[in-house]
């Protein structure tokens, strides 16, 4: 299931905890991984009393749950932290909640930002 060589990917980066982790708040992240490991992008968010709070976006290491997913779609019905992952450059720009049990699809569009590159 590996690709022989870790493919470099770029993902949208965001970190709500950027000050404490001493990183940029947002930008682009160049992904680096091990040989024979796949690389993914991800997004995670919380629903605080009806308000969607984006918490993190970036690169995600080899995870079979993310294989061959071109779009970032969270499928858990009502988690504490919504999580989606996908394969393809910047595939985590838009993210969607589409519960497996059925229910409305909700897609979140990113606000326009001037990205900075993180490595």
């Amino acid at each position: 299931s590996g690709r022989g060589e870790a493919e470099t990917r770029e993902c949208i980066y965001y970190n709500a905890n950027w000050e404490l982790e001493r990183t940029n708040q947002s930008g682009l992240e160049r992904c680096e991984g091990e040989q024979d490991k796949r690389l993914h992008c991800y997004a995670s968010w919380r629903n605080s009393s009806g308000t969607i709070e984006l918490v993190k976006k970036g690169c995600w290491l080899d995870d079979f749950n993310c294989y061959d997913r071109q779009e970032c779609v969270a499928t858990e019905e009502n988690p504490q932290v919504y999580f989606c992952c996908c394969e393809g450059n910047f595939c985590n720009e838009r993210f969607t909640h589409l519960p497996e049990a059925g229910g409305p699809e909700v897609t979140y569009e990113p606000p326009p930002t001037a990205p900075t590159l993180l490595t």
Epitope: N17, L20, E21, T23, Y42, A43, S44, R46, V55, K56, G58, C59, W60, L61, D62, D63, N65, P79, Q80, V81, F83
Partner: antibody
Framework: QVQLVQSGAEVKKPGASVKVSCKAS????????MHWVRQAPGQGLEWMGI????????SYAQKFQGRVTMTRDTSTSTVYMELSSLRSEDTAVYYC??????????????WGQGTLVTVSS | DIQMTQSPSTLSASVGDRVTITCRAS???SNWLAWYQLKPGKAPKL??????SLESGVPSRFSGTGSETEFTLTISSLQPDDFATYYC?????????FGQGTRLEIK
């Protein structure tokens, strides 16, 4: 089932460093953040910091900033917590704890058995 | 940092009693709150998360309520195994903080 197995008890002298390990099994190691929490004798629980095993990024409580280093080895599904410049007040049971959620922090659904670190001259 | 204050610090009760432990946050934590049970020499055990969700495998006599700054853990009918120390924890924002603990002892 999820298991977190920590290294054994340590006795250290003031000024020394200690490195505690926590080996995870029963789940996808890189998918869930890992926390370190300690409990000093007769005291409550104190959060020390967090590591994201997927990328290795860390966040430490201000109290431990500059003295604590959390690392991980994805090949062995192990996280490490190193605390330097030990003093007697660092005598405590140190726990690793797995986060319940993916991609961000939340509560802890599995804990290691704890490692007693005693700092004494 | 968000301060978490539990009351009472110690609680004496008997088997079969209904007991309530309160946890107050110094600022809103929405419903990002968990409760843990600690026993000497054992790993802490998650009881409640997201203020009111019962962790899988935890007996239904445990329940949690509250939001924003005030939360309660209730044990509807105390069992011998429930005598322990209980901690609340907020995970609304870094740093994650715990209450000082409530020791539940046999009367």
């Amino acid at each position: 089932q999820v298991q977190l197995v920590q290294s054994g008890a340590e006795v250290k002298k003031p000024g020394a460093s200690v490195k505690v390990s926590c080996k995870a099994s029963g789940y996808t190691f890189t998918s869930y953040y890992m926390h370190w929490v300690r409990q000093a004798p007769g005291q409550g629980l104190e959060w020390m910091g967090i590591i994201n095993p997927s990328g290795g990024s860390t966040s430490y409580a201000q109290k431990f900033q500059g003295r604590v280093t959390m690392t991980r080895d994805t090949s062995t599904s192990t996280v490490y917590m190193e605390l330097s410049s030990l003093r007697s007040e660092d005598t405590a049971v140190y726990y690793c704890a797995k986060d319940q959620s993916r991609g961000w922090y939340s509560n802890f659904d599995s804990w290691g058995q704890g490692t007693l670190v005693t700092v004494s001259s | 940092d968000i301060q978490m204050t539990q009351s009472p610090s110690t609680l004496s009760a008997s088997v079969g009693d209904r007991v309530t432990i309160t946890c107050r946050a110094s600022q809103t934590v929405s419903n990002w709150l968990a409760w843990y049970q600690l026993k000497p020499g054992k790993a802490p055990k998650l009881l409640i998360y997201k203020a009111s969700s019962l962790e899988s495998g935890v007996p239904s006599r445990f329940s949690g309520t509250g939001s924003e700054t005030e939360f309660t853990l209730t044990i509807s009918s105390l069992q011998p195994d429930d005598f322990a120390t209980y901690y609340c924890q907020q995970y609304h924002s870094y740093p994650i903080t715990f209450g000082q603990g409530t020791r539940l002892e046999i009367k």
